[in-house]
């Protein structure tokens, strides 16, 4: 792992990767851009999946928070031979299937796509590839577009979030390169730190929230702070206010001293969530401290 | 061929627990989800939950929570699945299906023979 | 969760006729839609995938189709075998949810 920048964010990033025939000669170029954001992302409850599409989808290696299944998955992603078609909406499809299956008792992990495409989609293949993202961003997926050589950028715009989750690479596959950081950037979501990180027990706080990304959801008045406390219930809340690099939120009244509150963010008004190992803890405080 | 098989018919008091097992054959059973769905008498269908059978992880609907569990015994390849506080409206025949994946994924193919629950006092 | 309002809750009809089943979805849910036929005393069976596939196995004269909040199951002409109940289906997102069911007799 090369140093630099780093996400902490711990959410579901899944790779959608063109292996249609038009990539054939820029396999290489393709994994090592994947290789090195892969490792870019370093928090412990961060799991990625690496799906490939052509003629069909396949998932080639399933969610997985286990480094060494990643450094295997990588592996297997480097071995790939491309040729087929571009069923784009196929490698969506393989992710919505994992998202939904992610869905446990009402809770899901937020999910972040990563997807990648060096073609312009022809009509009908464009419609079923934005209607795939459709049902991927409703089961909660933020999606995101790498466009290399010969993509339709407005195409990519419809398919991704908005224009602004279109990352064009317009000098061809070497230049996959420099767009990490600008991706690594805008795709993570993390909660770095709350302060106060201790609050008084049955009193009212406010607490911020820092991180990063938090103005990355398509809509800022879906964004909610919420509270798992002591691993059973979560109680969410809507921030007073949302900036990039912080929230400032109501922290729900904890009654007993040693309470812990595990804080998580929700960019879609609590579809799915971003989980983080910041903990809030409740303490006695006496009159006048 | 893909075969589902449930246990027999079963009465049982209200407040008790019913237990009904699916046997799974013909097929890989860790590769497929199973989920559980069921009909009361002459009404519709109602999705119950899923199983994951490689991990054990589990889904059920709201309505279900806190009184279902579903659980796995890879080494039989059967899926079971557990109702508790049992109540005269939980009167009826229990399928498991099985998630026949990409590209049919959620559609439910094939189905158990069903599993008859008379809760009666 | 969503909701899936099938009509006609029941109809008549005979053999050799077109007979059309429809399903509103309380909000769009794409081609993820499936249909199924249940015989009495037994397990449903599965006629229709997204929206419009025919399950292998599955006679030609069921077709379906839509897309969005509406879909029909069509039964080109009635066969004596068809007289059954006939359920949708929606996965487009958690929970899973089911039409309450169209009953199909005999004239």
């Known amino acids: 792992e090369d140093g630099g920048p780093a996400c902490y964010g711990g959410f579901d990033l899944y790779f959608i990767l063109d292996k249609s025939g038009s990539v054939l000669h820029h396999w290489n170029e393709i994994y090592y851009f994947v290789e090195q954001l892969a490792h870019k992302f370093i928090s412990p409850q961060l799991r990625m999946s690496f799906i490939v599409f052509s003629t069909r989808g396949t998932t080639l290696m399933k969610l997985t928070e286990d480094r060494e299944q990643i450094r295997q998955g990588l592996e297997e992603l480097q071995k790939v031979l491309p040729g087929g078609d571009t069923y784009m909406h196929e490698g969506f499809e393989r992710a919505s299937e994992q998202i939904y299956y992610e869905n446990r008792q009402g809770y899901r992990t937020a999910s972040v796509i990563i997807a990648l495409t060096d073609g312009e989609l022809h009509e009908d293949l464009f419609f079923y590839s934005e209607r795939e993202a459709n049902r991927s961003r409703d089961l909660g997926a933020i999606v995101y577009c790498v466009g290399v050589k010969d993509f339709n950028e407005t195409q990519l715009a419809r398919i991704a979030d908005s224009k602004d989750h279109v990352f064009p690479v317009n000098d061809g596959f070497q230049a996959l390169q420099g767009i990490i950081h600008s991706i690594l950037k805008k795709s993570c979501i993390e909660i770095l730190a709350a302060e106060p990180s201790t609050i008084c027990a049955g009193e009212s706080f406010q607490v911020v929230v820092r991180g990063n990304g938090f103005r990355h959801a398509r809509n800022v008045d879906r964004v909610l702070c919420s509270f798992k406390i002591n691993d059973s219930v979560t109680l969410n809340e809507k921030p007073f206010s949302v900036e990039d690099t912080y929230l400032l939120c109501p922290a729900p009244i904890l009654k007993e001293v040693g309470m812990k509150a595990a804080l998580q963010v929700s960019m879609n008004d609590g579809l799915s969530f971003i989980s983080s190992s910041v903990i809030i803890t409740t303490t006695h405080c006496s009159d006048g401290s | 061929e893909v075969q589902l098989v449930e246990t027999g018919a079963e009465v049982k008091k209200p407040g008790a627990s019913v237990k009904v097992s699916c046997k799974a054959s013909?097929?890989?059973?860790?590769?497929?989800?199973m989920h559980w769905v069921r009909q009361a008498p002459g009404q519709g269908l109602e999705w119950m939950g899923w199983?994951?059978?490689?991990?054990?992880?589990?889904n059920y609907a709201q309505k279900f929570q806190g009184r279902v569990t579903m659980t796995r015994d890879t080494s039989i390849s059967t899926a079971y699945m557990e109702l508790s506080g049992l109540r005269s409206d939980d009167t009826a025949v229990y399928y498991c299906?099985?998630?026949?994946?990409?590209?049919?994924?959620?559609?439910?193919?094939?189905w158990g023979q069903g599993t008859l629950v008379t809760v009666s006092s | 969760d969503i909701q899936l309002t099938q009509s006609p809750s029941s109809l008549s009809a005979s053999v050799g006729d077109r007979v059309t089943i429809t399903c509103r979805a309380s909000?769009?849910?794409?081609?993820?839609l499936n249909w199924y036929q249940q015989k009495p005393g037994k397990a449903p069976k599965l006629l229709i995938y997204?929206?419009?596939s025919l399950q292998s196995g599955v006679s030609s004269r069921f077709s379906g189709s839509g897309s969005g909040t509406e879909f029909t199951l069509t039964i080109s002409s009635l066969q004596p075998e068809d007289f059954a109940t006939y359920f949708c289906?929606?996965?487009?997102?958690?929970?899973?949810?089911f039409g309450q069911g169209t009953r199909l007799e005999i004239k």
């Open positions: 299906v099985r998630d026949p994946g990409s590209p049919k994924w959620l559609a439910f193919d094939p």
């Open positions: 013909g097929y890989t059973f860790t590769g497929y989800y």
């Open positions: 199983i994951n059978p490689t991990s054990g992880s589990t």
């Open positions: 909000r769009a849910i794409s081609r993820y």
């Open positions: 997204a929206a419009s």
């Open positions: 289906q929606q996965t487009y997102s958690p929970p899973i949810t």
